[in-house]
């Protein structure tokens, strides 16, 4: 619009003046006036501001508490927060990753569809017909039943979703 109907995108209104906001990584020390410019200062060590702002205090970087199973995935800068992730074998309980829980194991009869990551839990699936899992595991997929035929054996005991088939020798009495 001409003329402007508000301060410009990176400005804010104070005392009849459109003042520049502080850029990411800096905090506001003093508003601009008729005589002076906006005064901004860089955030200190372990602090950040990730937007154009008029904040008088920077935010503290997130602490990745090892007692909660957390570790630093990406170190924070003056413009970005620290990103935490979980130690091996654990995953975040929320998007903010404030604490971790042990990866879930898939019970016998279930196999791992998707291995857990630092931010997502194990996804299990029931073993379909022809497959089994006889262990509780966070890594094992469902295994296919043994093919007795390819070993020149016969099925002596049918497989289930938790057990493999049992193969045995062919009945020699058969013609």
């Amino acid at each position: 619009p001409e003329p402007p109907t508000a301060c410009r995108e990176k400005q804010y209104l104070i005392n009849s003046q459109c003042c520049s906001l502080c850029q990411p990584g800096q905090k506001l020390v003093s508003d601009c006036t008729e005589f002076t410019e906006t005064e901004c200062l860089p955030c200190g060590e372990s602090e950040f501001l990730d937007t154009w702002n008029r904040e008088t205090h920077c935010h503290q970087h997130k602490y990745c508490d090892p007692n909660l199973g957390l570790r630093v995935q990406q170190k924070g800068t003056s413009e970005t927060d620290t990103i935490c992730t979980c130690e091996e074998g654990w995953h975040c309980t929320s998007e903010a990753c404030e604490s971790c829980v042990l990866h879930r194991s898939c019970s016998p009869g279930f196999g791992v569809k998707q291995i857990a990551t630092g931010v997502s839990d194990t996804i299990c699936e029931p073993c379909p017909v022809g497959f089994f899992s006889n262990v509780s595991s966070a890594f094992e997929k469902c295994h296919p039943w043994t093919s007795c035929e390819t070993k020149d054996l016969v099925v002596q005991q049918a497989g289930t979703n938790k057990t493999d088939v049992v193969c045995g020798p062919q009945d020699r009495l058969r013609a």
Partner: antibody, heavy 125, light 107 residues
């Protein structure tokens, strides 16, 4: 203190292009729109357009559309104005100027509070 | 485009004189008007914005008035450093045009 320092004088042949720079200091460059104004020898002031240094989006006066390009490099707080297909009547002093906005009586009033020292562009064969 | 016509184009005055420059707009521009002072070989300097608001650091002998289509810049007591060319500018409709200028000379 706010300063706008422009590049030095240029002599160009008709049909050529010229690129004038304007380096800002003493304020947050991306926070204020930058304008370009020219002044032919012994003549008045002519508004050419502006650039939003944050987004890089320009707006040009109709008269210069197709011949002028306004850009910026925020990493060095510098705005640029390039004029192509130069003619002898483009001989002028080119100024960059910062926009200030004042709010009063429910309206937002712009004006140009800081100006560069000017860059003389001479177009001559 | 909105035309701004300044009068007079030239003005001879003495130190201590009260000087008035007029700027007429070809259509109403509310208070979207600024005044600038320019000395030879120098960039323009902002004096008045929003038709009547004095820019910080500008001596109080300068004042602006008017709204709509008729505006005035007044120098209450002309000083030696005030001999210069003065321009009005409308900032309501693109292109933001300037008046042709008023040159204030020493009588």
């Amino acid at each position: 203190q706010v300063q706008l320092v422009q590049s030095g004088a240029e002599v160009k042949k008709p049909g050529a292009s010229v690129k004038v720079s304007c380096k800002a200091s003493g304020y947050t460059f991306a926070g204020y729109y930058m304008y370009w104004v020219r002044q032919a020898p012994g003549q008045g002031l002519e508004w050419m357009g502006w650039i939003n240094p944050d987004s890089g989006a320009p707006t040009y006066a109709q008269k210069f559309q197709g011949r002028v390009t306004m850009t910026r490099d925020t990493s060095i707080s510098t705005a640029y104005m390039e004029l192509s297909r130069l003619r002898s009547d483009d001989t002028a002093v080119y100024y960059c100027a910062r926009e200030k906005i004042y709010y009063g009586s429910g309206n937002y009033y712009p004006s140009f509070d800081y100006w560069g020292q000017g860059t003389l562009v001479t177009v001559s064969s | 485009d909105i035309q701004l016509t300044q009068s007079p184009s030239f003005l001879s005055a003495s130190v201590g004189d009260r000087v008035t420059i007029t700027c007429r707009a070809s259509q109403g521009i509310s208070s979207y008007l600024a005044w600038y002072q320019q000395k030879p070989g120098k960039a323009p300097k902002l004096l008045i914005y929003a038709a009547s608001t004095l820019q910080s650091g500008v001596p109080s002998r300068f004042s602006g008035s008017g709204s709509g289509t008729e505006f005035t810049l007044t120098i209450s007591s002309l000083q030696p450093e005030d001999f210069a060319t003065y321009y009005c500018q409308q900032l309501v409709s693109y292109p933001w045009t300037f008046g042709q200028g008023t040159k204030v000379e020493i009588k």
